[in-house]
């Protein structure tokens, strides 16, 4: 009778993570008597995957009933495949012996490759806010994919970015891989509503790439512009001085009025108006009684925005001449109870 051969018909098998792998193996004879075992890898360090007669292998099932007298099908199924299961699997026939069973014949091996989806890309921006015209870095990370080939693109508001560097680790063979990319983005004053998108394409995603996003509203700081104006209101001896704070982001802002260098009032921006580009406007005003003044008054609007050093704009109030209209009130609303008399 012809000597037993162990046949593994599949040189390779490709399985998606989470699915079941079927590894086929048949023997050409019932003789010699002895069990079939499956191993991953070869040599002394090989890992036992299945033993026909003993051992605990909860993920493994046999395709056919190995207790049938004439069974020569030793194919197995391995459930819930992960990238860690990748490798070459050998179906090995043993001959019963003493003290231990003796390896008799091995199949040629079946290489199991595992396709694993990348994790959802996570995009993170700089720890501190930056102002327009500055360049900031964004990172994108995705993990756990296999095979190694992967494509990563960066977009800002739908426009593809070109200034980025990408690494896939590890460089050598591995059960799964990670990608890390850093993109440089130049901020503009219009970026409050902008988004940076990291897009990852992989064979497991069937043409439907994964995206991670970062809102530039978390990154940008648009400093305000200040304008101080005056116009007469009510009685002729009263002047309304307004401080227009325009185009700032984020909203966190504190305004202080100074009269001849002395603090008059401090307030926090509350009822702001939002511009189409996502920045904010706000106006504060002060009523000044000039009738008792012999000298000019220097009024300063000082703004501290988002914890940054204060910026200020001053206005000289002439008290010698009859107050004339200087500038116009361009704000739709006045805020707070801001009357202030100077005696």
């Amino acid at each position: 009778e012809e000597e037993l051969q162990v046949i593994q018909p599949d040189k390779s098998v490709l399985v998606a993570a989470g699915e079941t792998a079927t590894l086929r193996c048949t023997a050409t004879s019932l003789i010699p008597v002895g069990p079939i075992q499956w191993f991953r890898g070869a040599g002394p360090g090989r890992e036992l995957i299945y033993n026909q007669k003993e051992g605990h292998f909860p993920r493994v099932t046999t395709v056919s009933d190995l207790t049938k007298r004439n069974n020569m099908d030793f194919s197995i199924r391995i459930g819930n495949i992960t990238p860690a299961d990748a490798g070459t699997y050998y179906c090995v026939k043993f001959r019963k012996g003493s003290p231990d069973d003796v390896e008799f014949k091995s199949g040629a091996g079946t290489e199991l490759s595992v396709r694993a989806k990348p994790s959802a890309p996570v995009v993170s921006g700089p720890a501190a806010r930056a102002t327009p015209q500055h360049t900031v870095s964004f990172t994108c990370e995705s993990h756990g994919f296999s095979p190694r080939d992967i494509t990563l693109k960066w977009f800002k508001n739908g426009n593809e970015l070109s200034d980025f560097q990408t690494n896939v680790d590890p460089v050598g063979e591995s059960v799964s891989y990670s990608i890390h990319s850093t993109a440089k983005v130049v901020l503009t004053r219009e970026d409050v509503h902008s988004q940076v998108i990291c897009e990852v394409a992989h064979v497991t995603l069937q043409g439907d790439p994964l995206r991670g996003t970062a809102n530039l509203s978390e990154t940008i700081r648009v400093p305000p512009t200040l304008e101080v104006t005056q116009q007469p209101v009510r009685a002729e001896n009263q002047v309304n001085v307004t401080c227009q704070v325009r185009k700032f982001y984020p909203q966190r802002l504190q305004l202080t009025w100074l009269e001849n260098g002395n603090v008059s009032r401090t307030e926090t921006a509350s009822t702001v108006t939002e511009n189409k580009d996502g920045t904010y406007n706000w106006m504060s005003w002060l009523l000044v009684n000039v009738s008792a003044h012999r000298d000019d008054v220097k009024l300063t609007c000082q703004v501290e925005h988002d914890g940054q050093p204060a910026v200020s704009k001053s206005h000289d109030l002439k008290v010698s001449a009859h107050p004339k209209e200087q500038g116009s009130n361009t704000a739709a609303e006045n805020t707070g109870s801001n009357e202030r008399n100077i005696y």
């Epitope: 008597v33 002394p44 360090g45 090989r46 890992e47 036992l48 007669k53 003993e54 051992g55 605990h56 292998f57 009933d65 190995l66 207790t67 019963k96 003290p99 231990d100």
Partner: antibody, heavy 114, light 108 residues
């Protein structure tokens, strides 16, 4: 449901023999080796040997060679452990264990006493 | 035959304490063939860890196993009262198969 049902308490005289049984249900006994393990009171576990019920082939730990004999009857899905020339050293609990190692019988307590 | 030596033979641990039990083999054992059992008084042993590091069904994740060659260990990250039991390592790498002498783990 997989179960291994072992015979009850045995009290035997020194020098005699005893045959312990282990009846399997919920699986085909021929699909796995069947192991036997000894545990003396408050002691460790000792591997006695294993049998392949499919063909009766068996392996023994050197210590139990000549002392223990394992057999199996596939028609009744039962494995047996025969212990001969009993002494007080054989007083112990004897377990049968399916080859996949996660299913154990409840144990048979053997007392050798005159 | 391969002799498995477990240490310590007996130990006690406080709740929340990290516990490590060791199993040393007299000659190399392939990690696929090194198992651990838990046994409580009056009960049959229960398969606890198989193939060195895989937890059997129902075993809490505070348990872990590791090792290779001649040195293996079972670790409990945070000891609980229900972990008080005897633990045995077992090799079926070569005949005769052997158990370690066991470690009796008590709760303080």
């Amino acid at each position: 449901e997989v179960q291994l049902q072992q015979s009850g308490v045995e009290v035997v005289q020194p020098g005699a023999s005893v045959k312990l049984s282990c009846t399997a249900s919920g699986f085909n006994i021929e699909a796995y080796y069947m192991h036997w393990v000894k545990q003396r009171t408050e002691q460790g576990l000792e591997w006695i040997g294993r049998i392949d019920p499919e063909d009766g082939e068996s392996k023994y730990a050197p210590k139990f060679q000549g002392k223990a004999t394992m057999t199996a009857d596939t028609s009744s899905s039962t494995a047996y452990l025969q212990l001969s020339s009993l002494t007080s050293d054989d007083t112990a609990v004897y377990y049968c264990v399916r080859g996949s190692y996660e299913y154990w019988g409840q144990g048979t307590t053997l007392t050798v006493s005159s | 035959q391969i002799v498995l030596t477990q240490s310590p033979a007996i130990m006690s641990a406080s709740p929340g304490e990290k516990v490590t039990l060791t199993c040393s083999a007299s000659s190399s054992v392939s990690s696929s063939y090194l198992y651990w059992y838990q046994q409580k008084p009056g009960s049959s042993p229960k398969l606890w860890i198989y193939s060195t590091s895989n937890l059997a069904s129902g075993v809490p994740p505070r348990f872990s196993g590791s090792g290779s060659g001649t040195s293996y260990s079972l670790t409990i990250s945070s000891m609980q009262a229900e972990d008080a039991a005897s633990y045995f390592c077992y090799q079926w790498s070569s005949y005769p198969y052997t158990f370690g002498g066991g470690t009796k783990l008590e709760i303080k």
